[in-house]
Each structure stands twice: as C-alpha cells, then as structure tokens.
C-alpha cells in the first residue's frame, strides 16, 4: 500500500483512506463507546468463500468489519493516550529526581521507554496487519460484487434483447391478426351475400312449394272424386251382378260383394286396374285368410307377386320353419312372402318364376323359369322348375330335380351337414348346392369369399355374395 491516512470528518466519523495503485478507498467508520475485548471472535486468517456473498450477507459482514475497525481505532487512540500519560509521569519523575542518580535514572528510563516503544511498535504492527488483512478481504468482496453486478447487467441486457425480439414478434403477429381480421370481414361479407342469395332462393322455393301444395290439394280432391266414382262404379257392377244372379235361378244366389274385390295375386290386382307398384292385400285361394304382398306393376308387363326380396341386410333370414311358412319381414323392403301361400297359389294354376339379381359392380341378371310350383308342407315345400331362360347362367342355380325346403330347425337337405346351419337361411338346399338367396347379407368389399352369403353360383360363382335379389311369380297365361 502506498498510503494509509486517518482523519475525522465534519460529523465526527473517523475516516480511513487506503491508496492502492491508482485506486483510493475511503472508509467512514462510526464512533463506538465500547471497545471489543481481546477475546473477540475475530479470525484474521479465515478462508474466504469463492462465490460472491448474497447482498444482505455482505452488508452484515461490512457492518462487522466497521465495528472491528472502530474497535481497533479506539484501541490505538487509547494506546496513544497511555503512552502520552506515561511520558508525562516519567518526565515529572525525571524532573523531581534530576539531581539524584541522574545518570542511572536516565539509563533506566531510556531502557523503559525503548522497551515500551518496542512493545507499542509491535502491537501497532500487529494492528496494521489486521487492518490490511481486513482491507484485502473487503477489496475481494467488492470485486466479487462487481463481477456479480456485471453478470446481472449482462442478464438484463439479454432479457432486454429478448423483450425486443418478443415485441417484434408481437407486432408481426398483430399485423397478421389485422390481416386475418380484414380477410374475415371480406369472408363475412361474401357469406352475407351468399346468405342473401340463399334467402331469395328459399323464398322462391317456398312460393313454388306453396303452388305445389295447392296443386296437391287439387289433385287429392280430384283423386277423392275419382275414388268415389270408382266406388260408385263398383257398386253398380255389384248391383248388376246381384241382379243377374237373382234373375238366373240356375246360378248360386249367395255371391258376396267382398268376393268380387278380393285378389288372389298381383296379376288380378293389375287386371282390376291397379297398375301402381305397392303393397296390396291378397287372399289365400279358397279361403278368407289374407296376406300382404308387394306387387311390381311395371317390370316386364307388370302383375308380378314378389315372394322374396333382399336389398340391404335389414332383415334376418336365419328363421324357423314356421316363419318361412307364414312369411316374415316388410313387403316394402326385405321379406319372404310365405311358403304356404306360394304353395297354395302355384298349385291353382301354372305360374312362371323370375329371379332378378344385382351384383356389387352395377350388373344385373335374371333367371326365368316357365313353370314353377311348390309342393305342400307334407312334402316339405319341394320346388319344381322347368324351362330356364335368362342371363344369370345357362344352368339352373336351383338344383334339378328340385329339393325339399330346409331351415335351421327343419333339415331336409342331402348333406351330412345341415346346410341351413352351415350356410344360414332357409332354402331348397341340395348338398348344399349352387344357390342360396336367403344367405347372410354381406356389404360391399366384404362380399367375396363368403360361402354362406347370397349365392347364385352360375352367375357369380362360389364365394360371391350378391347385393340384391327379387323372386317374383305371375300366372303363365298373363
């Protein structure tokens, strides 16, 4: 150290100035009443920590150092006073005893003074060493604080640049949002325009619908009139027939009015003037028992009684013997008309059977048998077919001669197995044979390699399950 000064400032604080190189450190230390005892827990050679101390810790440590410095200062002052006091006392003694043994006394005093001076010098050196040690430590701490401050400044700068970046990004996003808002507004406008156009269209359609409704009302009225007229005509015809039957005694006088308007099949319905496709009520031959059937009045001249239809897999065809006997399903959708009705009907007169098929690739085909009938239940509704024509194969996919009908609970096939169990559905199975239009319904892309599907072998092969099938009958003389 180049310089070490001690002075008092205007408010009574002791001032210590340390000159180190080009730097000058000034410490302002407050006055303390009590002096730290020599047993104070100060260790001059304590190892310092590497990392900078926390701020609060540093402040406390500085206060401790200030206290120690203050104590040292007071101690030095006391030491000075003590030396001065001793010097005064000894000067008085010298003056009093000047005459007596001056030489001896002077030597003794000189020795005393030298010893004391040496002692004081040693103590001062020790104190100075302590002060320097503490000053060094303070300097290192200041250096650590300086480093910490630099680090914090760097972090602040980094954060500032990050904030600036975020602000830039924010402004970019704000611009984007604004642009999107503009776009959204434009889109909303175009949507509003479209909505307006649609509203115009809807109002136009509403007016058209109103007109159509009016027309429907008119048509309904006309229809009602026509129906009334038809009813009147029927009544007139019936009256005439009654008159005829009563006038002719050879004829049966009890001809029921109902008998004249009941139909055995769709051919009769067609011939009576009903030429629209739909569900009609048919009557069993020689019976009052009725059954609902779908009539196809358009295909191939009309008059077809639909006895089977598959189209969407909505109806389960794995049914009992009784269900196949009486029929099941919905005549407007998938259904089986019933073996008993078909057997009775086809044994009254000669019927043709047409089987219409659709595959999943949009192709259609048919098989037409010029003579078809079913045996009675006693003979297991055995199928009889003759004269095959059509596009669904040159060979009949219903085995010839015909087989008995089989169901899951009525096994009449020629297989060791139960074909109905194996292939599902009731059918005229052989062993098990080339067809089963009552098999499992498989949707598109699941319809190949299905041996229990809707099969018509001589059109699509073994494992192909068809999309739609219709079996229909009509009198051969229609």
């Amino acid at each position: 150290y180049n310089n070490f000064r001690k002075s008092m400032d205007s408010i009574g604080k002791k001032q210590y100035q340390v000159q180190h190189g080009s730097c000058s450190y000034t410490f302002l230390l407050p006055e303390m009443d009590n002096c730290r005892s020599s047993s104070s827990p100060y260790v001059s050679n304590a190892v310092q920590r590497d990392a900078p101390l926390e701020y609060d810790d540093s402040v406390q440590r500085l206060q401790v150092l200030e206290n120690i410095m203050e104590n040292n200062t007071q101690w030095l002052m006391k030491l000075e006073n003590y030396i001065q006091d001793n010097m005064k006392k000894e000067m008085v003694e010298i003056q009093q005893n000047a005459v007596q043994n001056q030489t001896a006394v002077m030597i003794e005093i000189g020795t005393n003074l030298l010893n004391q001076t040496a002692e004081q010098t040693r103590k001062l050196t020790d104190v100075e060493a302590q002060v320097l040690n503490q000053t060094t430590r303070l300097e290192l701490q200041l250096l650590e604080h300086s480093l910490s401050t630099n680090k914090l400044e760097k972090q602040i700068l980094d954060q500032t640049s990050e904030i600036n970046k975020l602000q830039d990004k924010n402004s970019f996003l704000e611009k984007k949002v604004l642009a999107m808002e503009d776009k959204h507004i434009i889109q909303l406008q175009s949507i509003k325009e479209e909505k307006d156009q649609l509203q115009v269209l809807v109002s136009k359609q509403n007016s058209i619908i109103e007109e159509l409704e009016k027309k429907i009302v008119t048509a309904t009225v006309n229809n009602s009139v026509l129906q009334k007229q038809q009813h009147d005509l029927m009544e007139t015809v019936n009256n005439l027939l009654t008159m005829m039957s009563t006038s002719n005694s050879a004829k049966d006088p009890t001809v029921a009015k109902e008998e004249q308007i009941s139909f055995r099949d769709c051919a009769e319905v067609f011939k009576s003037g009903h030429t629209t496709n739909g569900i009609y009520t048919l009557t069993f031959p020689n019976s009052t028992e009725e059954i609902k059937a779908y009539c196809d009045m358009e295909a191939g001249g009309g008059g077809w009684t639909i006895i089977q239809r598959r189209e969407d897999g909505s109806v389960d065809f794995q049914r009992t013997w009784k269900e196949y006997k009486v029929g099941f399903g919905n005549p407007s959708g998938e259904y089986w008309l019933g073996n008993e009705f078909v057997s009775q009907l086809t044994n009254q007169q000669r019927y043709v059977l047409k089987i219409h098929l659709k595959d999943w690739e949009g192709n259609e085909a048919y098989s037409l048998y010029e003579h078809f009938y079913l045996s009675s239940e006693e003979l297991n509704y055995r199928i009889h077919l003759k004269g095959l024509t059509g596009t669904a194969g040159k060979i009949s996919s219903i085995s010839q001669p015909g087989n008995d009908f089989s169901t899951k609970d009525g096994d009449n096939d020629k297989c060791i197995c139960k074909c109905s169990q194996m292939l599902t559905g009731g059918w005229w199975f052989d062993a098990c044979g080339p067809s089963n239009l009552n098999g499992m319904y498989y949707p598109q892309r699941q319809n190949t390699n299905k041996f229990n599907g809707i099969k018509w072998y001589y059109w699509k092969g073994s494992g192909y399950s068809l999309k739609a099938t219709t079996m229909m009958i009509r009198p051969a003389d229609f």
Partner: antibody, heavy 121, light 107 residues
Framework: QVQLVQSGAEVKKPGASVKVSCKAS????????MVWVRQAPGQGLEWMGY????????GYNQKFEGRVTMTTDTSTSTAYMELRSLRSDDTAVYYC??????????????WGQGTLVTVSS | DIQMTQSPSSVSASVGDRVTITCKAS??????VAWYQQKPGKAPKLLIY???TRDTGVPSRFSGSGSGTDFTLTISSLQPEDFATYYC?????????FGGGTKVEIK
C-alpha cells in the same frame, strides 16, 4: 382313377417368381374347385386359395393377396399357381388339392404329390 | 381367422393302443371339420369330413366326433401303418385353417 400330378421341384432366388402346375385326370375338371395348400419344412399346412375351373372364379388367403395368381387351362385340365416376389420363408412344399364340392370350398379329398420350391440366394 | 389348436403335439404309442387326438376351434365351426393323415414325404390323405364321416376306403378304426368348438379323432387300435402326423381342418369359415398337427410315434 382320380389323380393330380404336379410339376417338379424348383430353386429360385429371392424376388423371383415361381409357377407350379397341377394336371388333373380321372374326373370332370370343371366340376370341382381346386385349392392350393403349402407346407414349410417341418411345419403345418397353410391354405393359400382356390380356383373354380368352371368360371375362373378365385379366392385367395389375405396373407398371399397381391403375390399369388391361380389360373386354369380347361383344355388340358391343368391348374396353375404363380407366386411372385419370393422370400426365403416361401421355401415349402406346394400342394394342389381338389375340393369335394363345386359350389363350396369344403374339405379336400384328392391331393397332388407336392412340389418343393426352395428360395435361396 | 379361426385358430385350430391340436393336442397333444406328439404322442408315443404301441401297436394295438387306443389313441385320441383333440382339436379345439377358437370359435364355433358347427361340424365343418375334416381330419387328414400325412406320412413323411407324402401328401395329406383325407380320413374324416363333417366331423364324423369317414371317407371312402378309410378303415373303421378311425372315428371322429364333436361339434361347435371341440373335436376328437380316435384310432381305436393303432396299426403299424398309422404312425404318421394327423391334422384337423375347419372349413366353416373363410379362410379354411388347419391345426398344428399331432405326430403319432412308435413307443
């Protein structure tokens, strides 16, 4: 008597194709479906697919779909099975067999003697 | 695909012994099960179809039984020519599948 005679053994490199033939005799070739079954060395039987000689209809095991083609030549009563993109695990004995029914792929009552196909680089 | 699990995988027996091989299907296959016999280096031979019907020329010592998921092939009195591997086969559902086989060996 009813007989199925297959072509001889083949050695193929990975990635190659093999076409095995099966000549039928002693019955009406178009009246029965023909199936192909393979057996890897020391392993069980694996059904590959079938062909209906009457109409050329086929059905393949999904495992071989896209790699196998089954065909027939009714004039010579011969069935063929072609397997493409051969791998080492295709090394097996390939059998043709007749189904007992034309209309369904039931059980197999007559078998060929088998054709060993070895796939090795 | 329907799994056919055969057991045992091998059985050691003597001539005259009664041998029973079982096959379990992973789902109901009705009675659509066949049994085949295969000798080393030879093609399989049909023994039984529809679970219990013997094919033409198959000796009566071979019998099959079962329905649904559990099937059995029984050789009532093992003969020297019966030492072979036996396979069960379901044809109820596509694709047809086989059991892993049961090897009948001489004790």
């Amino acid at each position: 008597q009813v007989q199925l005679v297959q072509s001889g053994a083949e050695v193929k490199k990975p990635g190659a194709s093999v076409k095995v033939s099966c000549k039928a005799s002693g019955y009406s070739f178009t009246d029965y479906n023909m199936v192909w079954v393979r057996q890897a060395p020391g392993q069980g039987l694996e059904w590959m697919g079938y062909i209906d000689p009457y109409n050329g209809g086929t059905g393949y095991n999904q495992k071989f779909e896209g790699r196998v083609t089954m065909t027939t030549d009714t004039s010579t009563s011969t069935a063929y099975m072609e397997l493409r993109s051969l791998r080492s695990d295709d090394t097996a004995v390939y059998y043709c067999a007749r189904t007992r029914d034309r209309y369904d792929v039931w059980y197999f009552d007559v078998w060929g003697q088998g054709t060993l196909v070895t796939v090795s680089s | 695909d329907i799994q056919m699990t055969q057991s045992p995988s091998s059985v050691s027996a003597s001539v005259g012994d009664r041998v029973t091989i079982t096959c379990k299907a992973s789902q109901d296959v009705y009675i659509a099960v066949a049994w085949y016999q295969q000798k080393p280096g030879k093609a399989p031979k049909l023994l039984i179809y529809w679970a219990s019907t013997r094919d033409t020329g198959v000796p009566s010592r071979f019998s099959g039984s079962g329905s649904g998921t559990d099937f059995t092939l029984t050789i009532s009195s093992l003969q020297p020519e019966d030492f072979a591997t036996y396979y069960c086969h379901q044809y109820s559902s596509y694709p047809p599948t086989f059991g892993g086989g049961t090897k009948v060996e001489i004790k």
